[in-house]
Amino acid sequence: EINGSADHRMFSFHNGGVQISCKYPETVQQLKMRLFREREVLCELTKTKGSGNAVSIKNPMLCLYHLSNNSVSFFLNNPDSSQGSYYFCSLSIFDPPPFQERNLSGGYLHIYESQLCCQLKLWL
Amino acid sequence: EINGSADHRMFSFHNGGVQISCKYPETVQQLKMRLFREREVLCELTKTKGSGNAVSIKNPMLCLYHLSNNSVSFFLNNPDSSQGSYYFCSLSIFDPPPFQERNLSGGYLHIYESQLCCQLKLWL
């Protein structure tokens, strides 16, 4: 496993695929996390609660994901190797208020031939 | 005047400075617009209304700006010329509800010597 950053560990690599981790504060109860590659939304995961506190998880783009109480990890099997691409996470916080959206960590992922290596630039 | 894009006209140049235009829907009545350069918030403008409909404009970072009913333009006199930087606008919508934040147009601004020229890549 090679990590893009020992501090943030946004990118990690497994069997030719990449895991991209999007962290969020543990206080956040209801959220939407989106993973962008440049302007394209690759993955979107929404967690909400109803009035009876039942939890709904929506994954409309059918991404492989893992949700914990402070991060969403998306698993991409075929990262774009044609060029270095800029990936970043966008977090919409529904609960607790106030409603807000934060651009989270982002980084450039450079893939050379079949080797997965990562040049990471954290920005938010 | 040189425009980064004839369609969006996010960047335009005047006397060595750059005007960055952040568009928003005309239906938005109360908002916060932030201009980012990479991870750094350069400018922030908040327009709110009180219960008597009095308008409050907050400009805590003392940016030069122009506010219209569908855009906020920020004027930067000394854009960072050390390297190409990625600029984007972030819009928080307070009114009308639901509260939300949108990442608006973004682009790379490349400055070579004293010449201002722009390579723009729209992403949202």
């Epitope: 206080t27 109860q29 209801q30 929404t46 909400t48 609660k49 109803g50 009035s51 009876g52 506190n53 039942a54 709904s56 929506k58 529904f94 609960d95 607790p96 208020p97 | 009308p96 509800p97 639901p98």
Partner: antibody, heavy 117, light 111 residues
Amino acid sequence: EVQLVESGGGLVKPGGSLKLSCAASGFTFSDYWMDWVRQAPGKGLEWVGNIDEDGSITEYSPFVKGRFTISRDNVKNILYLQMNSVKSEDTATYYCTRWGRFAFDSWGQGTLVTVSS
Amino acid sequence: DIVMTQSPSSLAVSPGDRVTINCKSSQSLLSGSFHYLTWYQQKTGQAPKLLIFYASTRHTGVPDRFMGSGSGTDFTLTINSFQTEDLGDYYCHHHYNAPPTFGPGTKLELR
């Protein structure tokens, strides 16, 4: 502006059925859980049930579970309440409400259902 | 199910009065750092309206004379300087678990 408009109320006999509708506008309907809350004449508020954003999760009050069904049409922006095997104690004004993540932040004007023979 | 109780059930008030309505839950409504307790106002012949959520946060547009407070199982809605347009019924409500339940309500009437 958020608007919720209920319809379909009226007189129904005990054991009968009725379907209420709630037309939503002014917001992205498919982004929100929606609920039904009722109020018997001269009484307080009582939660009936809810449905999540795409209709895959529903919850019901124990008083209506097995008799009432909540559904939604996210293309038409309509919330439904199918009431079967109604009882006299189901007589109430039925309100359609938007669950704004942590409260009922928008309510319809209500539609009156009267169960009587 | 969590049982919500309110006191008083009715209250005669005059303009300018400081009004206090109490709500008690049968178990704590604290989840994380928030209390899942909401207050609604209902005027005669109208649908309820959201006043306060998370026990103490005023909803958009609610006058600042309305204040919510409390923790654990005991909560209070205070109206500082009651106005005649505040007449109506007030309900507390929890969304800690299913089923969410309302208190029986408190009716404010003119003295």
